[in-house]
């Protein structure tokens, strides 16, 4: 009874299409598959950034797989052939592993790469990234930013650089069609007459770095002798109402400070008839239903009422 064996896939490689971290892993079928013509061969692929403790594992019938990686580090991958038990009268058969690695040869010392990269997607409309030049680099050093996300044919360079002393220190991006809820890849590389400059790679999702505008049209309405309803409107722009969380700060008579976090554009406040002054501010943030993270907006303009019994008025800013 001869032991069934299968070869590993051939020509296993990691291909960089120039998408700043989105790589193709591809391979060819193993040699000598003739005995298994009726069989659907599968492949188990494992890959990770070098230094990561865990492998990502994929089982596929295809001859390729695509995923995003951190190009600041190397990438290692391995693959073997799987013959399912239906083909082998009993147990699954696995080939030995084929292995490959990929890394971008780093130029320049790490200190030359950009420092303190910070990106904010203002009001889910305008992306702005800023950075500081590398440590000890000369003024002749300039940095260039490239970006890519799925849907673009190729990586694009920044259209509008922000400059300081002639050096690029930031980028205002053009509009980004259908760019949220997917990985957004950035590379900032550099050039200098004097020494090579280390490139930096960044990956994030735009919906997770949104800083909304503050809420507008803050109003008070007396609901009853001991309740006041605070209301406001969602900020102007493309973010739907269902995506907001709000934080309110309320100050009564210069003493009591109430803070609360709410999901809609109203908050009912218990008050006493003695309340002479009431002020509140609100800020907004994209909530967990629309993003995994976000940045609080600035506080709204303060809305106050003082000097008259709050029960006598509906107050509108």
């Amino acid at each position: 009874d001869t032991e069934i064996k299968v070869n590993p896939p051939q020509d296993f490689e990691i291909v960089d299409p120039g998408y700043l971290g989105y790589l193709y892993l591809q391979w060819q079928p193993p040699l000598s598959l003739d005995h298994f013509k009726e069989c659907t061969v599968e492949y188990e692929l494992k890959y990770r950034n070098i230094g990561s403790e865990t492998w990502k594992t994929i089982i596929t019938k295809n001859l390729h797989y695509k995923d995003g990686f951190d190009l600041n580090k190397g990438i290692e991958a391995k693959i073997h052939t799987l013959l399912p038990w239906q083909c082998t009268n009993g147990s699954e058969v696995q080939s030995s592993w084929a292995e490959t690695t990929y890394w971008i040869s780093p130029q320049g010392i790490p200190e030359t790469k950009v420092q303190d990269m910070d990106c904010v997607y203002y009001n889910w409309q305008y992306l702005l990234c800023s950075w500081k030049p590398g440590i000890g680099v000369l003024l002749d050093t300039n940095y260039n930013l490239f970006y890519w996300y799925e849907g673009l044919d190729h990586a694009l360079q920044c259209v509008d650089y922000i400059k300081a002393d002639g050096q690029n220190i930031g980028c205002r991006f053009p509009y980004l069609e259908a760019s949220d809820y997917k990985d957004f890849y950035i590379c900032v590389n550099g050039s200098s007459e004097n020494k090579p400059i280390r490139s930096s790679y960044f990956t994030f999702q735009l919906q997770n770095i949104v800083k909304p505008l503050p809420p507008v049209y803050l109003t008070f309405t007396r609901e009853s002798s001991c309740e006041i309803k605070l209301k406001w409107s969602i900020p102007l722009g493309p973010i739907p109402a269902r995506c907001f969380d709000y934080e309110i700060e309320i100050r009564e008579d210069d003493t009591t400070l109430v803070t609360a976090t709410v999901e809609n554009e109203t908050y009912t406040l218990k008050t006493t008839n003695e309340t002479r002054q009431l002020c509140f501010v609100v800020r907004s943030k994209v909530n967990i239903y629309c993003s995994a993270d976000g940045i609080w907006s600035e506080w709204s303009d303060k809305q106050c009422w003082e000097g008259e019994d709050l029960s006598k008025k509906t107050l509108l800013r």
């Epitope: 203002y122 694009l156 360079q157 259209v159 922000i162 400059k163 205002r172 991006f173 053009p174």
Partner: antibody
Framework: QVQLQQPGAELVRPGASVKLSCKAS????????MNWVKQRPEQDLDWIGR????????DYNQNFKDKAILTVDKSSSTAYMQLSSLTSEDSAVYYC????????????WGQGTSVTVSS | DIVLTQSPASLAVSLGQRATISCRAS??????????MNWFQQKPGQPPKLLIY???RQGSGVPARFSGSGSGTDFSLNIHPMEEDDTAMYFC?????????FGGGTKLEIK
């Protein structure tokens, strides 16, 4: 809520200078470029230049290089344009207008300051 | 400098009909896969208002009856259906390179 406030009018003598202001509110001042545009009665719009409040970087239309100086005061979210050696050719409405980079166009405009150069 | 030539200089269109204004650039205003062409509406005594940016994208709060198209050197602004409130001057403007330049304008009126 975005507002660009400009004084309504300025009357100046020929040969004098004038400093026009544009006070911005309702947005993060340093995130947007500020443009200045000239419009004479019944004439085309002329782009004078733009300043980036983030870093003070300025691009001028060469036709206005010796005429206009653009500055900003980030602490008061105000952009300024100083016009010098004024002649009757400089009588016009001057608009400030914000834009987020070159691909977005100029999305909010001030109401304009009418400058009249007359003795 | 990039010269923008608008045509026609004036146009009268019946209510509900289509108005088309053209803008031709002396050289391509395309770069980075973007057409840096914008359209503005201006009414007497008012500042210009952004209608279209990047050739075809609508400005904030602009009615859907305004649309832009084109690439390279040839662009057009379409208004359909024409409404009374659309009587105004219309300008094209390029932001591909400094100095930004405007077209000479098209005066649109009701027929």
């Amino acid at each position: 809520q975005v507002q660009l406030q400009q004084p309504g009018a300025e009357l100046v003598r020929p040969g004098a200078s004038v400093k026009l202001s544009c006070k911005a509110s309702g947005y993060t001042f340093s995130n947007y470029l500020m443009n200045w545009v000239k419009q004479r009665p019944e004439q085309d719009l002329d782009w004078i230049g733009r300043i980036d409040p983030y870093d003070g970087d300025i691009d001028y239309n060469q036709n206005f290089k010796d005429k206009a100086i653009l500055t900003v005061d980030k602490s008061s979210s105000t952009a300024y344009m100083q016009l010098s050696s004024l002649t009757s050719e400089d009588s016009a409405v001057y608009y400030c207008a914000r834009g987020y980079g070159t691909a977005y166009g100029v999305d909010y405009w001030g109401q304009g300051t009418s400058v009249t150069v007359s003795s | 400098d990039i010269v923008l030539t608008q045509s026609p200089a004036s146009l009268a269109v019946s209510l509900g009909q289509r108005a088309t204004i053209s803008c031709r650039a002396s050289e391509s205003v395309d770069n980075y896969g973007i057409s840096f062409m914008n359209w503005f509406q201006q009414k007497p005594g008012q500042p210009p208002k952004l209608l279209i940016y990047a050739a075809s994208r609508q400005g904030s709060g602009v009615p859907a009856r305004f649309s832009g198209s084109g690439s390279g050197t040839d662009f057009s602004l379409n208004i359909h259906p024409m409404e009374e409130d659309d009587t105004a001057m219309y300008f094209c403007q390029q932001s591909k390179e400094v100095p930004w330049t405007f077209g000479g304008g098209t005066k649109l009126e009701i027929k």
